[in-house]
């Protein structure tokens, strides 16, 4: 026999159900709430310190570089690469043609000076891009030198120095007591490298990793 | 954690949330249909009181497991 | 569309979903009580054979909407 | 030691050119370093004219236009100094120099330099 | 072109006296400058490069010092042989420029 208050038991059963399911819905939508809030917040709290990043990271430049010029790399308009803007750029590197005339240590040390080294040349094709920007009446410094007049030839950047990867004019290098290298044009050979004296001024090439903002 | 890899992992689990909660719903709804059927047989005609005006008010068997 | 904004406008199509899901599965829920609750007390007691052991294969009751 | 003499005649007319050799003995010039002129007005202000490297490679200084020629005779050690269309504001000392010691840091070698006047 | 300004162009002092010029350059020079005595009608003899080493054979009562733009050339207790002009140069960038010079006297 069913006792005579069932029916409000009942009732005040299907009340209590109808909260908890109904509490389970608002938690489950809070926590939807919340994983679409943080979706939506944090990458814009994620924009704005990668912003914060990025203009911190132009301020380190800027003392050197006023203007960066950028392209975007890829799809994702996250990604941008920049050269300082009278730079030119060439894969993963910028590069700049100094003209003013300064011995090989100077030369190295106003590379610096903007972020860069003396130019590391690794491939015919980077030789290639960068002679197109220099003068035939013109040498310039490269970030290889032989500091012990031995032969043991090194890049500015620790580059191992590859014998196969070279470009020196024939006959060259020819002179234990020059050890600094340069690019130049010889008319016979069109464009190659020469060993001379370091203290002897000449133009130079600078180059940096492109700055990824 | 970055931006994208965030926005990645927030899809995941919506995502999961999503089936998870599309399966209880079917799985419920099919019960649901069992039980009538069920139920039908058995009463010789007890849902006539529920008529196709009152399907949009139909409530949960008692079911102690809560929704997952 | 860059891969980040497709990854946020599918956050929200799953977030959406899952609201709608969510209240869809609660309703049901409810609707599933009550007609429990409604058909016992006219059929008296004519859900004795749906146990508590056949509680989990419980079915939708007679609806023609399709699941959203 | 190195040393370093300058000689060319000491009076010049205006138009005309101005003619010096600077003759080297002690080092070869041919072996390393740059040969500079550089020149001093009455007013005791110095300036750089350009110079000729080891190599035979040049460099004059802009504010010297296209007047200024510097050349050499590797064979008696020898560099030279022209400079055409010469006016009165080109009087001054000239000195010959060895640049690229204490690794470019300083000129250390200067001939005793020879006044040259230009005058009518 | 870097340009140098030498200060002062006429200094009079002592013997004994100590004494300092300077010479600031248009741009930063990395301490490449030099510095160099000359009396009359004497070719100039280099004091100082680098900004602060002394050439050879020169005196320790010389010293030279500075960074960047603003350099200085120091005299310790003056010596009769230490009149006459100086002059400081850059040697950064071609061309290296001059100071304009300064007379020091006998007061």
């Known amino acids: 026999m069913v006792p005579e208050e069932e029916p409000q038991d009942r009732e005040k059963g299907l009340w209590w159900f109808q909260l908890k399911v109904w509490s389970m819905a608002v938690v489950s939508i809070l926590l939807l709430s919340v994983c679409f809030t943080v979706s939506s917040v944090v990458p814009h709290n994620f924009m704005y310190s990668k912003t914060v990043k990025r203009l911190s990271k132009l301020r380190e430049y800027q003392q050197y570089h006023p203007s960066l010029t950028c392209v975007m790399e890829g799809k994702d308009i996250e990604d941008w690469s920049c050269c300082p803007t009278p730079w030119t750029s060439f894969q993963s590197s910028c590069y700049f043609i100094s003209t003013g005339m300064q011995s090989w240590t100077k030369s190295q040390k106003n590379c610096s000076v903007m972020g860069a080294d003396l130019v590391v040349i690794n491939t015919r094709e980077e030789q290639d891009f960068i002679i197109q920007n220099l003068k035939r009446n013109s040498s310039y410094f490269l970030g290889l030198s032989d500091p012990g007049g031995r032969r043991h030839w090194q890049w500015v950047d620790q580059t191992p120095y590859n014998e196969n990867v070279t470009f020196w004019h024939s006959g060259e290098p020819n002179n234990l007591d020059e050890r600094c290298a340069i690019i130049n044009f010889r008319s016979s050979e069109e464009w190659g490298w020469n060993d001379i004296h370091c203290h002897v001024p000449q133009k130079s090439i600078c180059k940096m990793k492109k700055i990824y903002i | 954690l970055g931006e994208p890899q965030l926005c990645y992992i927030l899809d995941a689990i919506l995502f999961l949330y999503g089936i998870v909660l599309t399966l209880l719903y079917c799985r419920l709804k099919i019960q649901v249909r069992k039980a009538a059927i069920t139920s039908y047989e058995k009463s010789d005609g007890v849902y006539t009181g529920l008529s196709t005006r009152n399907q949009e008010t139909y409530e949960t068997l008692k079911h102690e497991k809560p929704p997952q | 569309l860059g891969e980040p904004q497709l990854c946020y406008i599918l956050d929200a199509i799953l977030f959406l979903y899952g609201i709608v899901l969510t209240l869809l599965y609660c309703r049901l829920k409810i609707q599933v009580r009550k007609a429990a609750i409604t058909s016992y007390e006219k059929s008296d007691g004519v859900y004795t054979g749906l146990s508590t052991r056949n509680q989990e294969t419980y079915e939708t009751l007679k609806h023609e909407k399709p699941p959203q | 030691d190195v040393q370093l003499q300058e000689s060319g005649p000491g009076l010049v007319k205006p138009s005309q050119s101005l003619s010096l050799t600077c003759s080297v003995t002690?080092?070869?010039?041919?072996?390393?370093?740059?040969w500079n002129w550089i020149r001093q007005f009455p007013g005791n202000k110095l300036e750089c004219m350009g110079y000729i490297s080891y190599d035979g490679s040049n460099y004059y200084n802009p504010s010297l236009k296209n007047r200024i020629s510097i050349t050499r005779d590797t064979s008696k050690n020898q560099f030279f100094l022209s400079l055409n269309s010469v006016t009165t504001e080109d009087t001054a000392t000239y000195f010959c120099?060895?640049?690229?010691?204490?690794?470019?840091?300083?000129?250390?070698?200067w001939g005793q330099g020879t006044l040259v006047t230009v005058s009518a | 072109d870097i340009q140098m300004t030498q200060s002062p162009a006429s200094l009079s002092a002592s013997v004994g006296e100590t004494v300092t010029i300077t010479c600031r350059a248009s741009?930063?020079?990395?301490?490449?400058l030099a510095w160099y005595q000359q009396k009359q009608g004497k070719s100039p003899q280099l004091l100082v490069y680098n900004a602060k080493t002394l050439a050879d054979g020169v005196p320790s009562r010389f010293s030279g010092s500075g960074s960047e733009t603003q350099y200085s050339l120091k005299i310790n207790s003056l010596q009769p042989e230490d009149f006459g002009n100086y002059f400081c140069q850059h040697f950064w960038i071609i061309p290296y420029t001059f100071g304009g010079g300064t007379k020091l006297e006998i007061k």
């Open positions: 120099v060895r640049g690229g010691d204490y690794d470019d840091g300083g000129f250390a070698y």
């Open positions: 002690g080092y070869s010039i041919t072996s390393a370093y740059y």
């Open positions: 741009g930063n020079i990395h301490n490449y």
